[in-house]
């Protein structure tokens, strides 16, 4: 990780931007450091990578320096807490964040013993904050699932940390790939299960369409067909945004036919950017594209009480647009305009030529 022996406030803020933080006792003003076998409270100004923590998958708390997760040993719950392998089944690795308290199972919460070791106890309440963030709550950094693209697990979220090449990775990596694409494992041990997917990569927005996008040569638009994934509308929307794109908008019949052709072998319904999440605005494209072309299925019910607020595209239906409950899980298509051109320059817009 290359963390300096003492973390500057600026460096600390950089880590916090990545969801990595130092846990400080609100009352004692000291910070949790992971040692070889126990956790202790130390001077926060001597912050080092063994003081850096990150919320990971399955409510885990991962220590960067120690490459392990905070665990509660049920056979000796009052003993000082320690780090364990993050997929250990011998201890409880799940922690909840609640009003500055870190709580485990059976009402155990993270406390401090008289000797400055960190223990789990039911007796007292101890409050923890994020050091260097002006008393900020460590709950602000809670883990959010990062859904994969392509790969072999149909859009399953990354498992953090995952072990690859004898190292525990708490974020996506480019390691082991000649094409330099970001990836993660979707189970805790890559070599054992070989389950993986690409990660949404914001930097890929700069280079245009890499191998996980398909380019329409006529329009300078790239599409990503996630036809085996199964995400809610908002998860799909986030996945596209994280890659510098948006959920699919359809500006004309030419674009619709391009999408149809690329889905021809699949009888599938996919999320597109059409939504009425703003009830005052009704149906809109999430990328702001104006509604100059519509292809609603006649079966769609537009009565106000209908709670289907997100739009889908069905390649196997001529009237292809339908509405669905946004929490349904479906495949999805992302769209990205190349070269940062104002998308209204390249978005179809030639409908009168067809008539």
């Amino acid at each position: 990780e290359g963390v300096a022996a003492a973390l500057t406030p600026e460096r600390l803020l950089e880590w916090q931007d990545k969801g990595i933080f130092v846990i400080q006792s609100e009352s004692l003003k000291k910070c949790i450091q992971a040692g070889k076998s126990v956790l202790t409270l130390e001077n926060c100004k001597q912050a080092n990578k063994h003081m850096l923590w990150k919320w990971v998958s399955n409510h885990g708390l991962f220590n960067i320096g120690g490459s392990g997760c905070l665990g509660l040993n049920f056979s000796a719950p009052e003993q000082p807490l320690s780090l364990y392998e993050c997929d250990s089944t011998l201890v409880s690795l799940r922690w909840r964040c609640n009003r500055k308290m870190i709580t485990g199972p059976l009402q155990y919460s993270v406390q401090v013993a008289h000797d400055n070791t960190v223990v789990a106890s039911r007796k007292y309440i101890h409050k923890w904050i994020s050091y260097g963030s002006g008393g900020g709550d460590i709950c602000e950094y809670l883990h959010k699932d990062l859904h994969t693209i392509k790969g072999n697990t149909h859009g399953m979220p990354c498992m953090f940390p995952f072990q690859y090449n004898h190292q525990w990775h708490h974020e996506c990596t480019r390691e082991g790939r000649e094409d330099d694409l970001l990836w993660c494992a979707t189970t805790s041990r890559y070599e054992r299960d070989e389950k993986w997917g690409f990660c949404p990569d914001p930097t890929s927005a700069e280079v245009g369409c890499d191998t996980i996008w398909e380019k329409d040569l006529n329009s300078h638009i790239c599409y990503q067909f996630n036809l085996l994934s199964s995400l809610s509308w908002s998860e799909a929307h986030s996945s596209c945004q994280m890659q510098g794109g948006t959920l699919l908008s359809i500006t004309d019949e030419t674009e619709e036919n391009f999408i149809r052709e690329h889905m021809s072998s699949k009888t599938v319904e996919v999320w597109m950017g059409l939504n009425q999440l703003d009830e005052h605005a009704g149906w809109q494209w999430s990328d702001g594209t104006p509604l100059n072309y519509l292809n609603w299925s006649p079966e769609v019910n537009f009565e106000p009480f209908v709670e289907d607020h997100c739009g889908t595209f069905s390649s196997f239906m001529p009237s292809a647009w339908r509405s669905r409950d946004c929490e349904s899980t479906l495949p999805y298509i992302c769209k990205k305009y190349l070269n940062h051109i104002d998308h209204e320059i390249v978005e179809g817009g030639h409908h009168h030529h067809h008539h």
Epitope: A281, P290, I345, G349
Partner: antibody, heavy 126, light 107 residues
Framework: QVQLLESGPGLVKPSETLSLTCTVS????????WSWIRQSPGKGLEWIGY???????SYNPSLRSRVTISIDTSKNQFSLKLSSVTAADTAVYYC????????????????????WGQGTTVTVSS | EIVMTQSPATLSLSPGERATLSCRAS??????LAWYQQKPGQAPRLLIY???SRATGIPDRFSGSGSGTDFTLTISRLEPEDFAVYYC?????????FGQGTKVEIK
Amino acid sequence: QVQLLESGPGLVKPSETLSLTCTVSGDSISNYFWSWIRQSPGKGLEWIGYIHYSGTVSYNPSLRSRVTISIDTSKNQFSLKLSSVTAADTAVYYCARRGRIAAAGTGYYYYGMDVWGQGTTVTVSS
Amino acid sequence: EIVMTQSPATLSLSPGERATLSCRASQSVSNYLAWYQQKPGQAPRLLIYGASSRATGIPDRFSGSGSGTDFTLTISRLEPEDFAVYYCQQYGSSLWTFGQGTKVEIK
């Protein structure tokens, strides 16, 4: 042949709400986008907003806080409400239909406003 | 919000002459542009949509061109009934806007 007819009071007091209705005859209101436009005396056209029966609406940002456009498919009508009016809202108010063309498949392209009402003059005065 | 600017504000021409009206958008609207004609005391009438397609019943002396930000309405030979105010309107954004109008008057 499609016809649009605006109706509503010609005189509204300052700070009150202006309410106009546009009655559509000759076609189903469900097939199109419908719009309101106004024109102050001696001035140009100002777009107020549009609505589609699916629920899609869009309003001129300068009027958004005061305007509501609604649609009643059972009566084949759509309406405009403009609250907290002042003398600056004195204008001829037009309702209009947005034209459409069938695509080669099952979709439709929508374009400019191809059918207009004759307009109704609204004066804001006490 | 996309601002539409029309020029000139007034065009003084004689019947039979060619009229060229300009409309410029503050950002690209692709070809999502319409032209309207308005005579005193009347509602506007759609002339052109999609920047260059003539609306139903519009004589072929009216033609539109342009794409992106610059558009032109041309009346090849002015007839007496063509003297009116002409407006452009963009629908390349969900927030529609009109130009301020060009008045074509008899010289």
